[in-house]
């Protein structure tokens, strides 16, 4: 089984009650935004056949991702919340940096993929669907890697 | 179609032991964690331990030593192996499937096997 | 480990009626709380998920909310088939997975 390094994130960065409130800020409105509510793109689908080691590397993957296809082509919409969630989100994305796994992780990259060609699918309202899901992101990031 | 039945239980010494077993049918045990649950009559819910999709184990404190949890892939099938066995044990036993959607949820359940433990 | 307090442990209610359940968490568990629903001699049944998710299949008079500590059921008009027992379950993440999963106590729903 592949063995999860540095996958950590200590539970101090989800505990700063402004910054939480913000990124769900953020979430709630580019949410009222998204008219395609039938698709979840953090759901059952992206953990399947993921083990609980592996949680981490997949959802710093889904971070990663976000972060450089999302966020930062959108960071002039959302204000002012997106100024200030993306760098939040952007120090967790530094300090999952070293986060590794050993072995084989295709079937990791499989789910983002899929996960990655709905958004591209579904164009703009991909993009504000996955920071209408920052929230579960949030979360997901915290349960997984903490 | 996902099916989990459990099956096993019985009748049971104190000091004796027994093996549960949860066939499930509808998904694969290597794409889901299971858990077991138990629930004393008349009484609440109480989580036993979890095997994960690598076959890694996970147990309530109260559990470890006397409880292993353990699968066959190949059966479609996972075990409940409890040892030294007490009255307080007695209880409906369920096995349920974990999902992780970003939080671990339990669905489906089995129907439950029971096990009663009496001289 | 996180302790679960659910209240009232039962309560009676009418077809009809407007019911809701509270579950009190020991810490904070943000919004890692699920609802199960028991009828008597079957399996629990997964109702909500995310403190607020309603599950595939569950009828939308049900709805939960609540984070941090303090959660709510609320059936908004209970119905014949809803007489049941109501547990709360929280998933605690970053302590031993020996605490990771806790249920409450449960609530049963009796009819008046």
């Known amino acids: 089984a592949p063995i999860s390094s540095h996958c950590r994130l200590d539970k101090s960065n989800f505990q700063q009650p402004y910054i939480t409130n913000r990124t769900f800020m953020l979430a709630k409105e580019a949410s009222l935004a998204d008219n395609n509510t039938d698709v979840r793109l953090i759901g059952e689908k992206l953990f399947h056949g993921v083990s609980m080691s592996e949680r981490c590397y997949l959802m710093k993957q889904v971070l990663n991702f976000t972060l450089e296809e999302v966020l930062f082509p959108q960071s002039d919409r959302f204000q002012p919340y997106m100024q200030e969630v993306v760098p939040f989100l952007a120090r967790l994305s530094n300090r999952l940096s070293t986060c590794h796994i050993e072995g084989d992780d295709l079937h990791i990259q499989r789910n983002v993929q899929k996960l990655k060609d709905t958004v591209k699918k579904l164009g703009e309202s991909g993009e504000i669907k996955a920071i209408g899901e920052l929230d579960l992101l949030f979360m997901s990031l915290r349960n997984a890697c903490i | 179609e996902v099916q989990l039945v459990e099956s096993g239980g019985g009748l049971v010494q104190p000091g004796g032991s027994l093996r549960l077993s949860c066939a499930v049918s509808?998904?694969?045990?290597?794409?889901?964690?299971m858990i077991w649950v138990r629930q004393a009559p008349g009484k609440g819910l109480e989580w036993i331990g979890i095997?994960?999709?690598?076959?890694?184990?996970y147990y309530a404190s109260w559990a470890k030593g006397r409880f292993t949890i353990s699968r066959d892939s190949s059966k479609n099938t996972v075990y409940l192996q409890m040892n030294s066995l007490r009255a307080e044990d007695t209880a409906v036993y369920y096995c349920?499937?974990?999902?992780?959607?970003?939080?671990?949820?339990?669905?489906?359940w089995g129907q439950g096997t029971l096990v009663t433990v009496s001289s | 480990a996180v302790v679960l307090t659910q209240s009232p442990s039962s309560l009676s209610a009418s077809v009809g009626d407007r019911v809701t359940i509270t579950c009190q968490a020991s810490e904070d568990i943000y919004t890692n709380l699920a609802w199960y629903q028991q009828k008597p001699g079957k399996a629990p049944k997964l109702l909500i998920y995310?403190?607020?998710t309603l599950a595939s299949g569950v009828p939308s008079r049900f709805s939960g909310s609540g984070s941090g500590t303090d959660f709510t059921l609320t059936i908004s008009s209970l119905q014949p088939e809803d007489f049941a027992t109501y547990y709360c379950?929280?998933?605690?993440?970053?302590?031993?997975?020996?605490?990771?999963?806790?249920f409450g106590g449960g609530t049963k729903v009796e009819i008046k």
């Open positions: 509808g998904f694969s045990l290597s794409s889901y964690a």
């Open positions: 379950q929280a998933v605690v993440y970053g302590n031993s997975a020996d605490s990771r999963y806790t």
């Open positions: 095997i994960d999709i690598d076959g890694s184990t």
């Open positions: 349920a499937r974990d999902r992780f959607v970003g939080v671990d949820i339990f669905d489906p």
């Open positions: 995310w403190a607020s």
